[in-house]
Amino acid sequence: CDLPQTHSLGNRRALILLGQMGRISPFSCLKDRHDFRIPQEEFDGNQFQKAQAISVLHEMIQQTFNLFSTEDSSAAWEQSLLEKFSTELYQQLNDLEACVIQEVGVEETPLMNEDSILAVRKYFQRITLYLIERKYSPCAWEVVRAEIMRSLSFSTNLQKRLRRKD
């Protein structure tokens, strides 16, 4: 399955929008910094077959979409930017979903790397618990926004590597 060129453009647009969503200076939130232990090995395109990598990407985008679809998120961000960001993520999900469905339909496709899916899920669990612990404070959201920018950058790089493999 080849992801459309519009997919990587959408990824870049999502990153730009997330960058624009920042409301407070990151420097005022230095005391709130947290290591969420991003599962970097899951973004190593060499580790997986393409079908597995796409499943991991889908999980990453889906969890990001869910995180920014909560009521707490709506209260934290400027509404029009948040809606545009969510729309970009939704489009990416559709692209990835079509690819995963296509791969599922292909016989002999290796089983999904379940530990990679779990690693992504656990990463977002750590982010969710951090927000709860910090009572969804503006600084907590700023730290999370910066972290998601990081993870989306990893996703973009993985997609580039997948395209080079084709």
């Epitope: 889906q62 869910n66 995963v100 469905i101 599922v104 999904m112 779990l118 656990k122 750590r126 969710t128």
Partner: antibody, heavy 119, light 108 residues
């Protein structure tokens, strides 16, 4: 509000298959993995596997691999769990439970479906 | 597979008393992925505590959770009549996800 409504009780003969459904409402169906958990009479809870309704990929517990098939129908927001080669030990209440994160993990359950396997 | 062993299997106490339920894991479980559920006869399980010590929505403050590594505890500070049920610990730290065999809390 989130609701998971399961199909009714079933009685099956050993060797047969059963297909249990779980209809979701009150949230975006494709956003959350759906899990299946079973409970034999007077026994504890046992995780069987999960399905991502968005693309249909599944993760099964090794114990059920080859005998269980989880599918979904996005048009009706319904997931299905089919168990084949039934034996008496499969007599249990089968639950669907929605995934999520933090306080949303298994926060929503179906009402359960009793499957009785008897000759 | 991470085996969760709950003790005691049955706990007989009176309303007003303190209940301490244990869950021991066969190998280390990150506290973020250890949950507790309550189940009453004929009902589906109900989420009580998530990530070892956080109270789920609508759960009274008499319930609390603690622990780390391989030993986790659910405590009910002062039992109410509606607390008599079966309690399960659950982990999703690694596949396959597992539950303890349950502790039945019954009225003495």
């Amino acid at each position: 509000q989130v609701q998971l409504v399961q199909s009714g009780a079933e009685v099956k003969k050993p060797g047969a298959s059963v297909k249990v459904s779980c209809k979701a409402s009150g949230y975006t169906f494709t956003n959350y993995w759906m899990h299946w958990v079973r409970q034999a009479p007077g026994q504890g809870l046992e995780w069987m596997g999960e399905i991502n309704p968005s693309h249909g990929r599944t993760i099964y517990a090794q114990k059920f691999q080859g005998r269980v098939t989880m599918t979904r129908d996005t048009s009706t927001s319904t997931v299905y769990m089919e168990l084949s080669s039934l034996r008496s030990e499969d007599t249990a209440v089968y639950y669907c439970a929605r995934g999520g994160l933090g306080p949303a993990w298994f926060a929503y359950w179906g009402q359960g479906t009793l499957v009785t396997v008897s000759s | 597979e991470i085996v969760l062993t709950q003790s005691p299997a049955t706990l007989s106490l009176s309303p007003g008393e303190r209940a301490t339920l244990s869950c021991s894991a066969g190998s280390s479980v990150d506290s973020s992925y250890l949950y507790w559920y309550q189940q009453k006869p004929g009902q589906a399980p109900r989420l009580l505590i998530y990530s070892t010590s956080n109270l789920a929505s609508g759960i009274p403050a008499r319930f609390s959770g603690s622990g780390s590594g391989t030993d986790f505890t659910l405590t009910i500070s002062s039992l109410e009549p509606e607390d008599f049920a079966v309690y399960y610990c659950h982990q999703w730290s690694s596949y396959p996800f597992t539950f303890g065999q349950g502790t039945k809390l019954e009225i003495k």
